[in-house]
């Protein structure tokens, strides 16, 4: 049998049959169905949608579909006591107030339960004080403010523009700088593409549009009250003071009309350089405080949101494997949205729905995958990846023994320019081979493969003739599977041609204007990009679940390990004197990577030569491949981040969305020149090199001949 041929049935039921069954029209229909009302986590509407999906997945033919519920900490605005920000004069009178809600889009004026813009998990508070503009509130922005400009944010309210990094990192940075409140806003420079109209006439953000989002710093913990364990009916919950990752200062988001009113009065220091200026007609002065005429005016925040333990529901569907039912390939994406979820998440949920339908059709015709496929509709992703994390905590023992791969399925589109893939190196060859077999949906690439259009539009910076594949970071439901459990993971979506704004999202992200019409009118009228993403995600799942030998190439890990070792070594070599003084050597890491390379090469040769008709040897080789990702897990986790346990990859400590390689070494080296005790700091670098070298060597040995 060919590797993608189905199990125990006639050859017509192969990958092609699965892909041919996927229909753009169905994805469109499902998206419409999922986006007519809000599906905020913890609400009745989202519970009803969970039950609908459960029912439909059963109809599609899955063997079983269950709801898995958890009681987790969520956050909501106070319905009778709205959140807002004001400018107050010296008498304390409010002379300007920010808007209490977004103007609803046409056709949605009478929809109830649209949650107003808020920063989820903000504590309550009414701080008042002078404003300091902190650009994107990145680590380097605060370095610029504090070290170069000598501006002290202590006791100030900071205003930061959305974009570049995860909003939770912005809030953490502001807290560490001593701020007493944070205002987040969307600047047109980041959320208004030139030459495009604002919604409803185009896909740009209108001035009254606001990005919602959580501001936690969970570092992979899941429910803040039950870190490490499922939030089930007998859970022990921490007190709110001991909860993981909650912000300590009030935070609130606003649109650029309101931001204009705050920023136009700013005085104090001029912006340090052009990179601190957005596109509003304001000076982008840093402050602190307002300029001359307005210097007695202050900014006051009014935040009354509450944190509540609330029930959430995952939908878990099972398609049992015919040959290896104890090996799980998981396709998961979230269902909860901030409002309508036109892109996030329902463009992804609609694709998952169609993938389930296609698999179900094949199953009804007598087919089964070789391995078990689990389908998941996660809840409360927007509140900190809670549904996926709680389920993984509850099932961790099964997952760590049986988990082959996890494919994420949040938003299918964030643009319509080209494919974007982030995955473990183990999946590089799978992605390459699959995209070579799929047709490109791009204009100008008719009759060409997806691989060709993708490589042309998004070439790898390192490897000639290959497309860019990025490292996995976080900010989505793969986190627990990859960063905590070490299950090979990947994600794919269509993206924009906007490399400089990689982490800013699309303009209407998390706003009320993220509707079905946004997608149908402006992003993908024919749903051809959605169909392509369904083919990529579904094709990956099909091949992972059905190929006789797992489609993982360990040699690709060897290539990136050497690249990452070079990168971290070059960072360290910016301090040659200290490396000499403290006897810092990377030889152990280089040696471990070389050993990994040689062993991976030999393993690959054995993989090509072994007798695939011997089920014991086949299972043994597949287990070595499955457990390779697991071998990069350090049970002790990273320093101060116990749930980030992958030694090769972790979310950046400065931006949760971005992946960092050799994160333990990277963090130990970061800003090392400013450490008060250099001997201790360089000692930690040496320890992290040791941990990394040991882990790479240990992983290599899992690929050695077993006896």
């Amino acid at each position: 049998k060919s590797s993608n041929e189905a199990t125990n049935i006639t050859p017509k039921h192969n990958m092609k049959a699965f892909l041919d069954e996927l229909k753009a029209e169905n994805i469109k229909k499902f998206l419409y169905n999922f986006t007519q009302i809000p599906h905020l986590a913890g609400t009745e509407q989202n519970f009803q949608l969970a039950k609908q999906i459960q029912s439909q997945w059963k109809e599609f033919g899955l063997d079983s579909v269950e709801l898995a519920h958890y009681d987790v900490l969520l956050s909501y605005p106070n319905k009778t006591h709205p959140n807002y920000i004001s400018i107050i004069n010296e008498d304390g009178n409010e002379i300007f107030n920010t808007s209490l809600f977004e103007p609803p889009p046409p056709g949605y004026e009478n929809v109830s339960d649209i949650v107003p813009p808020f920063s989820a998990f903000s504590p309550q508070g009414m701080p008042e004080g002078d404003l300091v503009y902190v650009n994107y509130a990145r680590t380097e922005d605060f370095f610029k403010l504090e070290r170069d400009m000598k501006i002290n944010c202590s006791g100030k309210i900071v205003i930061a523009r959305y974009g570049k990094v995860f909003r939770g990192n912005k809030v953490k940075n502001a807290q560490l700088a001593g701020a007493k409140g944070v205002i987040l806003y969307s600047d047109p420079a980041d959320y208004f593409a030139p030459g495009v109209k604002s919604y409803p006439d185009g896909w740009n953000l209108p001035g009254g549009g606001v990005q919602r989002g959580n501001i936690l710093n969970l570092n992979g913990a899941g429910d803040p009250l039950t870190p490490g364990y499922p939030a089930n009916e007998y859970a022990y919950r921490r007190g709110i003071a001991e909860a993981v990752g909650l912000p300590s200062i009030p935070v609130h988001p606003i649109g650029y009309y309101d931001a204009q009113k705050l920023l136009e009065k700013m005085g104090g220091s001029a912006p340090p350089d052009s990179s601190w200026r957005g596109s509003l007609k304001v000076p982008y002065n840093v402050g602190p405080g307002f300029t001359g005429n307005f210097s007695t005016q202050k900014v006051k925040m009014h935040i009354h949101s509450t944190n509540e333990v609330t029930r959430i529901y995952n939908v878990i569907g099972t398609l049992r494997g015919a040959v290896e039912p104890d090996r799980y390939v998981i396709l998961g994406g979230h269902r909860d949205s901030w409002v309508f979820g036109g892109i996030d998440p329902q463009s992804g949920a609609a694709v998952v729905h169609e993938i389930v339908r296609s698999f179900g059709t094949l199953k009804k015709e007598g087919w089964r995958p070789r391995r078990t496929i689990l389908f998941a509709s996660w809840d409360a992703e927007e509140f900190g990846l809670l549904g996926s994390t709680e389920w993984a905590e509850e099932n961790s023992r099964l997952l760590q023994e049986r988990g082959v791969a996890y494919i994420n399925a949040d938003s299918s589109i964030e643009g319509n320019y080209t494919l974007r893939v982030d995955c473990t190196p183990l999946m590089y060859s799978l992605v390459h081979n699959l995209t070579k077999e799929l047709k490109s949906p791009d204009e100008g690439f008719e009759g060409k493969s997806l691989y060709e259009s993708w490589t042309k539009k998004s070439p790898s910076p390192e490897f000639s003739g290959m497309p860019r594949i990025s490292k996995l970071g976080s900010g989505n439901d793969f986190e627990v599977f990859f960063q905590r459990l070490g299950i090979a993971s990947g994600r794919a979506r269509y993206t924009k041609n906007w490399e400089t704004n990689k982490f800013s999202g699309y303009p209407l992200y998390h706003s009320v204007y993220e509707t079905y019409e946004l997608v149908e009118k402006f992003y993908d009228p024919m749903f051809k990009y959605h169909l392509t993403v369904a083919q990529v995600r579904g094709g990956m799942v099909f091949e992972l679940a059905n190929s006789i030998v797992l489609p993982f190439d360990c040699r690709d890990y060897a290539v990136v390990l050497r690249k990452y070792a070079d990168k971290i070594y070059s960072i360290s070599m910016k301090h040659p004197q200290e490396m000499k003084t403290y006897s810092v050597s990377f030889d152990s890491l280089f040696s471990a990577v070389k050993n990994f390379t040689e062993i991976a090469s030999k393993f690959s040769e054995r993989l090509q030569d072994f007798d695939k008709s011997n089920p014991i040897v086949l299972r043994m080789m597949n287990d070595q491949l499955m457990f390779l990702e697991r071998a990069f897990i350090d049970p002790l986790g990273l320093p101060d981040r116990p749930f980030y346990r992958h030694v090769i990859y972790a979310p950046s400590s400065h931006n949760k969305y971005a992946g960092e390689s050799f994160p333990g070494i990277y963090d130990a080296l970061f800003d090392i020149e400013s450490k008060v005790d250099p001997s201790k700091a360089w000692g930690e670098v040496k320890r992290q090199i040791y941990v990394a070298a040991f882990t790479v060597q240990a992983a290599a040995e899992t690929l050695s001949e077993v006896a």
Epitope: F463, A558, V559, R562, E598
Partner: antibody, heavy 122, light 111 residues
Framework: EVQLVESGGGLVKPGGSLRLSCAAS????????MNWVRQAPGKGLEWVSS????????YYADSVKGRFTISRDSAKNSLYLQMNSLRAEDTAVYYC???????????????WGQGTTVTVSS | SSELTQPPSVSGAPGQRVTISCAGS?????????VHWYQQLPGTAPKLLIY???NRLSGVPERFSGSKSGTSASLAITGLQAEDGADYYC???????????FGTGTKVTVL
């Protein structure tokens, strides 16, 4: 016997093209990284390009990037170098060489062909 | 321009010991990349002598040995023989260039 035999060299005008071939025998060609290395008259060795066993990792020297294309056909046990926009400074003996493993950055080149001469001149 | 520097020539009488140095940088030899040594007799293709810093290819006489330390490497020929007269090249990988790098080459003359 392990052997590499280059062919396709010759005299070409500046701006012209040539395609070099390298026929491999005596080893499992599909398992090894392969390279092109050149040597200008009276000069030292200069690495030109490298391709791994499954043609996914391809590298070029900066001096030939965008002009030369390396490829391989494992079914034919052959390595190729398509050279376009040739310049006078590309004049050299071109060697095909096998790497000891599938990772060009670790291993030495243990098998070399006899070389084929490329002369770029008007 | 090569990233690995070798002396243009070394010479010695038969039976003598000669060493050829190969000076690299922190992005090649100093970054843990192996050094390999090649011998090129006049009018012939290069031949691998030493791989992985210190390992002799089978069939290479024991009088050839390699070593590596820090950002440099060296090839020693003990008991020099007439047939050792040739050009010798070191080779490594440079991570900043993402490419193989050869040394400038050393001509060994047997007096």
């Amino acid at each position: 016997e392990v052997q590499l035999v280059e062919s396709g060299g010759g005299l070409v005008k500046p701006g012209g093209s040539l395609r070099l071939s390298c026929a491999a025998s005596g080893f499992t060609f599909s398992r090894y990284n392969m390279n092109w290395v050149r040597q200008a008259p009276g000069k030292g060795l200069e690495w030109v390009s490298s391709i791994n066993s499954n043609s996914r990792y391809i590298y070029y020297a900066d001096s030939v990037k965008g002009r030369f294309t390396i490829s391989r056909d494992s079914a034919k046990n052959s390595l190729y170098l398509q050279m376009n926009s040739l310049r006078a400074e590309d004049t050299a003996v071109y060697y095909c060489a096998k790497t000891m493993g599938d990772y060009y950055y670790y291993y030495g080149m243990d098998v070399w062909g006899q070389g084929t001469t490329v002369t770029v001149s008007s | 321009s090569s990233e690995l520097t070798q002396p243009p020539s070394v010479s010695g009488a038969p039976g003598q010991r000669v060493t050829i140095s190969c000076a690299g940088s922190l992005s090649n030899i100093g970054a843990g990349y192996d050094v390999h040594w090649y011998q090129q007799l006049p009018g012939t293709a290069p031949k691998l002598l030493i791989y992985g810093n210190i390992n002799r290819l089978s069939g290479v006489p024991e009088r050839f040995s390699g070593s590596k330390s820090g950002t440099s490497a060296s090839l020693a020929i003990t008991g020099l023989q007439a047939e050792d007269g040739a050009d010798y090249y070191c080779q490594s990988y440079d991570s900043s260039l993402s490419s193989y790098v050869f040394g400038t080459g050393t001509k060994v003359t047997v007096l």
